[in-house]
Amino acid sequence: SGLNDIFEAQKIEWHEVPRWRQQWSGPGTTKRFPETVLARCVKYTEIHPEMRHVDCQSVWDAFKGAFISKHPCNITEEDYQPLMKLGTQTVPCNKILLWSRIKDLAHQFTQVQRDMFTLEDTLLGYLADDLTWCGEFNTSKINYQSCPDWRKDCSNNPVSVFWKTVSRRFAEAACDVVHVMLNGSRSKIFDKNSTFGSVEVHNLQPEKVQTLEAWVIHGGREDSRDLCQDPTIKELESIISKRNIQFSCKNIYRPDKFLQCVKNPEDSSCTSEI
């Protein structure tokens, strides 16, 4: 579906940035980044009818325009605006699943519960999931050697700004009851510094969102504590309540059984607490 034509049309120099150039603390751009983004876009738009009219070449032009020739510590949300626009997607706003520090289970869940969506189930999230990218100031080259680390180098790097921007928009689009999956095995079940805690929580729209429902995922088989009473969950409840959004919380004691029951809800063992 035109992928070869698209690759042929690429005139940007995709060679590696020479090793003597700026070294950052984080890993470099994922190898074959342009090809990966384009291939993912083509695949996604073929599978999702509502995005079939999206032109993947334009999407790639917008993506590369956000970071190519720009200093990788000086990226803004405005740089990503064209990509955000082309990737605008109408997902059912009452079927949104946010997550924090428990991506795999959240994705397993939406793979089974097909009418719910994580950010990575949208075009833009799917394009960038698990990828790293950066360029460098005043050259059209992609840096495959190293990219800025959020902590050690700078927060306004291409990857961090992308996820901040796309996460904000995803949260802004949510309505009715929004679900969030949280990792009960971590010391901070709710972390104010996570993308969920620093971006998504603050961009839920109170005029559209009635309730945030947290699902706290337990790690150990014998863990029967009520993690909804955890101080960090109470902190989340306080933040949400102050924003005039209701809060509810559920313990998911057995994530394996939880997924099984999502697959087979009529199973007799699925009536008890999971």
Partner: antibody, heavy 123, light 110 residues
Framework: EVQLLESGGGLVQPGGSLRLSCAAS????????ICWIRQAPGKGLEWVAC?????????YYADWAKGRFTVSKDNSKNTVYLQMNSLRAEDTAVYYC???????????????WGQGTLVTVSS | DIQLTQSPSTLSASVGDRVTITCRSS????????LAWYQQKPGKAPKLLMY???NLASGVPSRFSGSGSGTEFTLTISSVQPDDFATYYC??????????FGGGTKVEIK
């Protein structure tokens, strides 16, 4: 003051081509999406295409416009163009260029419009 | 193709009347509320009245209000003034950054 001024309309035969221009003034041209919207006589509005040029050109089109219509931009002249090929009678319309509201909370709406230029496709 | 259906297509009103125009979208608009309303007078370009369903554009009188979400929206003029006799269009914003307009509602003097 924000101003958009379309030109280039006129009478063209079916199968012919025409290039419309939209000259912009009063704002930072590169920082906005400029779109073309048309209105057939006595009918409603129909979106055609959009372009944005922060560095390279980023453009996209309504499905029906792909292939026949091309949007482009000359930053030195602060002008957006709409090249229309293989014109048909049903392309007869007033063609407006419009500037989208700036900022992600406002994208998707047109705050400033030109006065329009009439394209008539007829033999 | 996305369809935006406005009703009624024509509406007769007197100065001071309360007027309501409905816009229905065949698909949910982006973000559940990404819908605009425009006013157009003969021979003129459209003028933005409302955005994000219920936000008044700059300089628009407060007698105009908007509501709705998802696929169903309304524009209300609480007390029609002589300057309000015009055609009104709704416009939705959708996946891929695409736009669609309604067919228009002409508000004429009774």
């Amino acid at each position: 003051e924000v101003q958009l001024l379309e030109s280039g309309g006129g009478l063209v035969q079916p199968g012919g081509s025409l290039r419309l221009s939209c000259a912009a003034s009063g704002f930072s041209f590169n920082n906005y999406w400029i779109c073309w919207i048309r209105q057939a006589p006595g009918k409603g509005l129909e979106w055609v295409a959009c372009i944005y040029s922060p560095s390279g050109d980023i453009k996209y089109y309504a499905d029906w416009a792909k292939g026949r219509f091309t949007v482009s931009k000359d930053n030195s002249k602060n002008t957006v163009y709409l090249q229309m090929n293989s014109l048909r009678a049903e392309d007869t319309a007033v063609y407006y260029c419009a500037r989208e509201l700036s900022g992600s909370s406002y994208e998707g709406y047109f705050e400033s419009w030109g006065q329009g230029t009439l394209v008539t496709v007829s033999s | 193709d996305i369809q935006l259906t406005q009703s009624p297509s024509t509406l007769s009103a007197s100065v001071g009347d309360r007027v309501t125009i409905t816009c229905r979208s065949s698909q949910s608009v982006y973000g559940h509320n990404w819908l605009a309303w425009y006013q157009q007078k003969p021979g003129k370009a459209p003028k933005l009245l409302m955005y994000r369903a219920s936000n008044l554009a700059s300089g628009v009188p407060s007698r105009f209000s908007g509501s709705g979400s998802g696929t169903e929206f309304t524009l209300t003029i609480s007390s029609v003034q002589p300057d309000d006799f015009a055609t009104y269009y709704c416009q939705g914003y959708y996946s891929g950054g695409s736009y669609a307009f309604g067919g228009g509602t002409k508000v004429e003097i009774k």
